[in-house]
C-alpha cells in the first residue's frame, strides 16, 4: 500500500533507501529538454515475489525537439554527472537483486533521466538519513524512518538525527555504533512491519551497497 506522504525532512540531511519494497514506484522523469516518449512507461515498478524481485517497465526519454528518438542505453559518464550523487557513487548493480527478499535494488539509470529520482514508497519501507556535506551528525537515536500503517492511515516515524554545521562528513548510514544497533531503537518506534532481521540485513546492505544515489524530491 502506497504511503501518503514523503519521509520527514531533516534540516541539512538527505535520505535514501537501501532497497525498495515491492509496489514501489519510480517515476519516469527526464532531464530538461527531454520528455517521456509517447506511450512510454509512466513509472518503473518494483515487482516480484518473496524469492525474486525486479523492476518492471523501462523509462525512456526523447528529445523534446526530436520526438522520434527512443533509444534506451546506459548514460555515458558525462551524462551521469548530472545526477545528484555523493562520494559513494560507484558502478550500478544489476537490476535483478534478491539479496533482501521482496525488495529491489536501485534501478540502473536511463538515458537523459532527470537529476532527481521521484519514488513513491509503500508501507514498511525504511529510509536512511545522512547529513549533507559540511554537516556532522549528532545522533539521539536511529537515523532512519519507516512508513507505518496506523488506524488506516500511513505515517513515517521520526528519525532521531540532528545535523550541525561542522566541516566533517559522516559515513552512511552513520559511523556511530548505536545507530546501527536494533537495540538502540526506541520502543515506540519499533515497527511490526520492519523486523529486526530486516533492519540487520538492511544495515549490512548499507555497509556493502554499491549503489548510492541520493534524492531530495520524493513527491
Amino acid at each position: 500500500e502506497l504511503c501518503d506522504d514523503d519521509p520527514p525532512e531533516i534540516p541539512h540531511a538527505t535520505f535514501k533507501a537501501m532497497a525498495y519494497k515491492e509496489g514501489t514506484m519510480l517515476n519516469c522523469e527526464c532531464k530538461r529538454g527531454f520528455r517521456r516518449i509517447k506511450s512510454g512507461s509512466l513509472y518503473m515498478l518494483c515487482t516480484g515475489n518473496s524469492s525474486h524481485s525486479s523492476w518492471d517497465n523501462q523509462c525512456q526519454c526523447t528529445s523534446s525537439a526530436t520526438r522520434n528518438t527512443t533509444k534506451q542505453v546506459t548514460p555515458q559518464p558525462e551524462e551521469q554527472k548530472e545526477r545528484k550523487t555523493t562520494e559513494m557513487q560507484s558502478p550500478m548493480q544489476p537490476v535483478d537483486q534478491a539479496s533482501l527478499p521482496g525488495h529491489c535494488r536501485e534501478p540502473p539509470p536511463w538515458e537523459n533521466e532527470a537529476t532527481e529520482r521521484i519514488y513513491h514508497f509503500v508501507v514498511g519501507q525504511m529510509v536512511y538519513y545522512q547529513c549533507v556535506q559540511g554537516y556532522r551528525a549528532l545522533h539521539r537515536g536511529p537515523a532512519e524512518s519507516v512508513c507505518k500503517m496506523t488506524h488506516g492511515k500511513t505515517r513515517w516515524t521520526q528519525p532521531q538525527l540532528i545535523c550541525t554545521g561542522e566541516m566533517e562528513t559522516s559515513q552512511f548510514p552513520g559511523e556511530e555504533k548505536p545507530q546501527a544497533s536494533p537495540e538502540g531503537r526506541p520502543e515506540s518506534e519499533t515497527s511490526c512491519l520492519v523486523t529486526t532481521t530486516d533492519f540487520q540485513i538492511q544495515t549490512e546492505m548499507a555497509a556493502t551497497m554499491e549503489t548510492s544515489i541520493f534524492t531530495t524530491e520524493y513527491q
Epitope: G23, N27, Y43
Partner: antibody, heavy 114, light 107 residues
Framework: QVQMQQSGAELVRPGTSVKISCKAS????????LGWVKQRPGHGLEWIGD????????NYNEKFKGKATLTADTSSSTAYMQLSSLTSEDSAVYFC???????WGQGTTLTVSS | DIQMTQSQKFMSTSVGDRVSVTCKAS??????VAWYQQKPGQSPKALIY???YRYSGVPDRFTGSGSGTDFTLTISNVQSEDLAEYFC?????????FGGGTKLEIK
C-alpha cells in the same frame, strides 16, 4: 496531502470557448504529468490528454485535437484546459487528475446551451 | 485505440458477499491497469495501480489481479459503502482508455 482544486461550473453558448482551471497543491507541480478526463452520462470516461508542467510537454487524444488546448502556469501551480467551438456534445463533467500516483479533482460541470 | 470492456454493467450483491468485477483489454496491456471507484456525485477515486497494488487508504478487501488482457477487481466482504461504479483503465498506450463501468448495487 495532494489536492486538485477545479474551477466552478460553467454555462456557455454554443460556438464560444471556455477555460477550466485546476490548481494543484501538496506536491511539486512541475514534476508530475497532469491529465484531463471527460465524463458524460452514457459515454463513460474519456481521456483528453495530459501535460507535463515542468516542460510544457503535452499528449492529446486524437479525438480532442483542435478541441482542447492544455496549458500550465508553474508560478501558480495551475493547469488549464481550453475548449473551443463548443457544441452540446461538449456538455460534460471535466476532471483534472495527477497522473501517477493518481489523484483527481472534484470535477467541473460544463453546460453548453443557447 | 485499445478497448477496455466491462461486460457487466450492473452487479447486485449483499453485504458480506464477495464480488468480482471483470475487465478485458482488446490487446495486451501488461499490468498497466488501474481501477477506480466512483460514488454518485463524486470524482473517481483510485483504488489499484499496476493491476494489483492498492493505493493508500484503500481497504484490503479490494484486490486487483490479472495481466495481459484479463483483469479482475475483487471485493470481499462487501460493505454498504462500496455501493458505487467501478472503472478499469489502461495506461499502456495512448490514448489511455477506460472501461464502460460496472455499477455495484447492494441488495
Amino acid at each position: 496531502q495532494v489536492q486538485m482544486q477545479q474551477s466552478g461550473a460553467e454555462l456557455v453558448r454554443p460556438g464560444t470557448s471556455v477555460k477550466i482551471s485546476c490548481k494543484a497543491s501538496g506536491y511539486t507541480f512541475t514534476n508530475y504529468w497532469l491529465g484531463w478526463v471527460k465524463q458524460r452520462p452514457g459515454h463513460g470516461l474519456e481521456w483528453i490528454g495530459d501535460i507535463y508542467p515542468g516542460g510544457g510537454y503535452t499528449n492529446y487524444n486524437e479525438k480532442f485535437k483542435g478541441k482542447a488546448t492544455l496549458t500550465a502556469d508553474t508560478s501558480s501551480s495551475t493547469a488549464y484546459m481550453q475548449l473551443s467551438s463548443l457544441t452540446s456534445e461538449d456538455s460534460a463533467v471535466y476532471f483534472c487528475a495527477r497522473v501517477t500516483p493518481a489523484s483527481w479533482g472534484q470535477g467541473t460541470t460544463l453546460t453548453v446551451s443557447s | 485505440d485499445i478497448q477496455m470492456t466491462q461486460s457487466q454493467k450492473f452487479m447486485s450483491t449483499s453485504v458480506g458477499d464477495r464480488v468480482s468485477v471483470t475487465c478485458k483489454a482488446s490487446q495486451n496491456v501488461g499490468t498497466n491497469v488501474a481501477w477506480y471507484q466512483q460514488k454518485p456525485g463524486q470524482s473517481p477515486k483510485a483504488l489499484i495501480y499496476s493491476a494489483s497494488y492498492r493505493y493508500s487508504g484503500v481497504p484490503d478487501r479490494f484486490t486487483g489481479s490479472g495481466s495481459g488482457t484479463d483483469f479482475t477487481l475483487t471485493i470481499s466482504n462487501v460493505q454498504s459503502e462500496d455501493l458505487a461504479e467501478y472503472f478499469c483503465q489502461q495506461y499502456n498506450s495512448y490514448p489511455w482508455t477506460f472501461g464502460g463501468g460496472t455499477k455495484l448495487e447492494i441488495k
